[in-house]
Interface confidence: low
């Protein structure tokens, strides 16, 4: 016997309290699937949520965060405050990058300079606390009276805080 | 079903540590947000502390900002706070929770009490 | 962060209506829950997103959430309700509050 209910369309639901007709949805609520037996509460964007897409009846509300938060979360579930490139948001607010570490973006953690000599190679461009470092060729490619930039000394930069 | 088991409380002299931990199951314990709420004997709820999934970014009451560290093992499911310099009026009995706010699905661990005397 | 004030206490006579409020500066562009908390146990979530309501909570449980007063409304209270109730206002952000608590007296 087939389910009466699996005729009702996404933005409808089977009402049971009408005999199984297929009731729209009522306001503030949606059904994305066909069959449904009730329809889900669309989802409020408030707070430093804002709305990046209308409820309907068929598709649930999302939303993204107001300008200074950026989504953290399957969905956006939270929001997270911005920091500026050069620093990292920790348990006492956005801090600046320490020496050695950079980060190019308004979000995550501060990350090590690229080591070059690792890789053979040399530091062309030195790293600051919004960019990694630029690794050039390594010096026995380097032609006779070329050189490279030389890497900064193990100081603390001005304007580093320790962590 | 989600089932969320703290441990560690006890008797602890001012200025000691001790170390909490919640053990989780029912769940996949990486995708969530991981919250730790206490409450002092006849008072209300106050909230302490949250830790991202990966562990990357922690968050803190200003009440416990500098002594406390909330961390988590997602290897394990467990979830930990590692209390130091403990004071009498952080007596309370602390809860796990997963905390969802907006959506259907905040439970709480039963509580493990910690109290601080000397 | 936002105050919540609730009232200590709330009593109310078996099957009427108990309202619980929770005001904080403009907590109505903010989402709040409601946890129901029963001497000895955790918290139990009876409200969350204002006015929804968990899977298991009884239909007597509402809330609704504007200006600055959230609301928890529990019509035909029963002897099984009293409690400690607790509002929690979130605005999206990472760190939670919590309200001072109210004690439902069924008298």
């Known amino acids: 016997l087939q389910d009466p209910c699996s005729k009702c369309p996404a933005g409808t639901f089977c009402d049971n309290n009408r005999n199984q007709i297929c009731s729209p949805c009522p306001p503030n609520s949606f059904s994305s699937t066909s069959g449904q037996k009730a329809c889900d509460i669309c989802r409020q964007c408030k707070g430093v949520f804002r709305t990046r897409k209308e409820c309907s009846s068929t598709s649930n509300a999302e939303c993204d965060c107001t300008p200074g938060f950026h989504c953290l979360g399957a969905g956006c579930s939270m929001c997270e405050q911005d920091c500026k490139q050069g620093q990292e948001l920790t348990k006492k607010g956005c801090k600046d990058c320490c020496f050695g570490t950079f980060n190019d973006q308004k979000r995550g953690i501060c990350r090590p300079w690229t080591n070059c000599s690792l890789d053979g190679k040399s530091v062309l461009v030195n790293g600051t606390k919004e960019r990694d470092v630029v690794c050039g060729p390594s010096p026995a490619d380097l032609s006779p009276g070329a050189s490279s930039v030389t890497p900064p000394a193990p100081a603390r930069e001005p304007g580093h805080s320790p962590q | 079903q989600v089932q969320l088991v703290e441990s560690g409380g006890g008797l602890v002299q001012p200025g000691g540590s001790l170390r909490l931990s919640c053990a989780a199951s029912g769940f996949t314990f990486s995708d969530y947000y991981m919250h730790w709420v206490r409450q002092a004997p006849g008072k209300g709820l106050e909230w302490v502390s949250v830790?991202?999934?990966?562990?990357?970014?922690?968050y803190y009451a200003d009440s416990v900002k500098g002594r406390f560290t909330i961390s988590r093992d997602n290897s394990k499911n467990t979830l930990y706070l590692q209390m130091n310099s403990l004071r009498a009026e952080d007596t309370a009995v602390y809860y796990c929770a997963r905390l969802y706010a907006q959506f259907e699905g905040d439970f709480w661990g039963q509580g493990t009490l910690v109290t601080v005397s000397s | 962060d936002i105050e919540l004030t609730q009232p200590p206490s709330v009593s109310v006579a078996p099957g009427q209506t108990a309202r619980i409020s929770c005001s904080g500066d403009n907590i109505g562009s903010k989402y709040v829950s409601w946890y129901q908390q029963k001497p000895g146990q955790a918290p139990v979530l009876v409200i969350y997103s204002d006015s929804e309501r968990p899977s298991g909570i009884p239909e007597r449980f509402s809330g609704s959430n504007s200006g600055n007063t959230a609301t928890l409304t529990i019509s035909g209270t029963q002897a099984e309700d009293e409690a400690d109730y607790y509002c929690q206002s979130w605005d999206g952000s990472i760190s939670r509050v919590f309200g001072g608590g109210t004690k439902l007296t069924v008298l």
């Open positions: 830790i991202s999934g990966s562990g990357s970014n922690t």
